[in-house]
Amino acid sequence: DICDPNPCENGGICLPGLADGSFSCECPDGFTDPNCSSVVEVASDEEEPTSAGPCTPNPCHNGGTCEISEAYRGDTFIGYVCKCPRGFNGIHCQHNINECEVEPCKNGGICTDLVANYSCECPGEFMGRNCQYKCSGPLGIEGGIISNQQITASSTHRALFGLQKWYPYYARLNKKGLINAWTAAENDRWPWIQINLQRKMRVTGVITQGAKRIGSPEYIKSYKIAYSNDGKTWAMYKVKGTNEDMVFRGNIDNNTPYANSFTPPIKAQYVRLYPQVCRRHCTLRMELLGCELSGCSEPLGMKSGHIQDYQITASSIFRTLNMDMFTWEPRKARLDKQGKVNAWTSGHNDQSQWLQVDLLVPTKVTGIITQGAKDFGHVQFVGSYKLAYSNDGEHWTVYQDEKQRKDKVFQGNFDNDTHRKNVIDPPIYARHIRILPWSWYGRITLRSELLGCTEEE
């Protein structure tokens, strides 16, 4: 111990320094550094000592601020107090706080203590400073946010004299029908299927599924993953800490979905899946999981029910032929809601209608997904809409297009079922959100989900 024996004379107190073998002395009045051996000289009987005071030189370490204090501190020193910067404590700010002691990393994140700071290493499906943002939502292959043009492949299998074509854009998780998956051509020796996300995104997992072709189960037993930012230069996903391509386990039957997560996650615009071993033909339905690069793009609870019925209100309600059992209430405006009455429909078709969600607390809203529905077989949807937001539910601000400085009109749906996602950038930070239908087909009809996060850093 550098302070044992005490190198400070005249009753000075020894403080170990941050560097090995270093120390400093806190000296009583009348003595000065470095070892409290120098006596402060007095100029004459009439004058005060020429000491610069207890804050000179600064006794506070690690950027602490020394403040002169008239009162006793009650422990060791008179005359000053050290105000410590974040990450340090102690009388002289000499101790580096271990921020990991309070377990700031959520969701299984691993905390590393740094000097006046900490970092969290998050599992693949979480992100953010404290791993507080979930990042494992479907990116839209199944729901249709990812369009047909965004899904391409090395080849397409053609059957029944070329009449049946198992196109790449059929590779949507849980797709139904006679032709309901992508199948690579028989002569394709190195098949792949590719998703263009249209912007760099954080991809944290993939779900795969096989299908039945001519009554026979077909599926991919194992596969590799590659990614790219330009669609030309590709990197294979590796086993962590090695240069070995990761081979992911695939399916064991034609219908059960199987999920794999990417830890660390992929950050890319393009993702390619390379089948390695297939049962019969390489046949695939799939979904990618992840979020926007910024995180904070998880469903806020319309679909899951986390947003409760009473939180969803509307300007008016439609009843099919005024039948109570065919009431298209706002609480039914939940993405992918099923049933004969499975959406909100307004009682009037005009631009004064709205669907409102009360998020209960101010929330960062970074995106929205909309969907139409059918009433008695008729396709109905909102083709475009505006957004408004409020913190008191009374005074509303319509979301503006930053460049044009006018109300932003978001592109809506073009059918009754496909998900249409719009990114809200810059995000809205508010408690109440209103969707304001601007154009529609049939009657104003909506199912929706809000994307964002409730925890702000």
Epitope: T320, L321, N322, K340, G377, H378, V379, Y441, G442, R443
Partner: antibody, heavy 125, light 107 residues
Amino acid sequence: EVQLLESGGGLGQPGGSLRLSCAASGFTFSSYAMNWVRQAPGKGLEWVSAISGSGDSTYSTDSVKGRFTISRDNSKNTLYLQMNSLRAEDTAVYYCAKEYYDILTGYWDWYFDLWGQGTLVTVSS
Amino acid sequence: EIVMTLSPATLSVSPGERATLSCRASQSINSNLAWYQQKPGQAPRLLIYGASTRATGIPARFSGSGSGTEFTLTISSLQSEDFAVYYCQQYNNWPLTFGGGTKVEIK
């Protein structure tokens, strides 16, 4: 030419069955909900039953529920009304009628912009 | 169910004259009302929907008005081809219901 043509009417026994057909032409049959409307001799019109374009939803008036079944075969552009447990009060001219539906705007409602000529059903012993 | 009452049951009018038919609903049906014309041995023909909007191909002499429970069909100048039976139909509530009919005959 856009038209509807009913058939299958005639004499039915009380408690018996009849099946009416309505052949559609000149429009995309599967895009439209279809209806049966009847008119008793010397009386007004009475709506009987409706079916959605895909055939997955139906509505019927209370007086025929459990006895009459509306159905359609879009591959044949044909609407049907299966009439079971016939009663004397079912005697009427039966019309098939196409719903109003504007495919451009998607607007639709429960009134009828195209009717067939009707087929007479007489229920008598 | 909503009862639709058409009056008068018979209306005798000379060609070129105005004919006014009334339809009353037993409760409010907003503007969800249609008018049809039926000639003997023929199928009904849609004239008016939404209480006041003329169907495709319907001459301007036919006009509709009203909302709630009281509705009117007006034929401004009767032509020979307009002599027929007229029906109103509400499509606000289930079941769909028609009025009993008004016969417009030559005076």
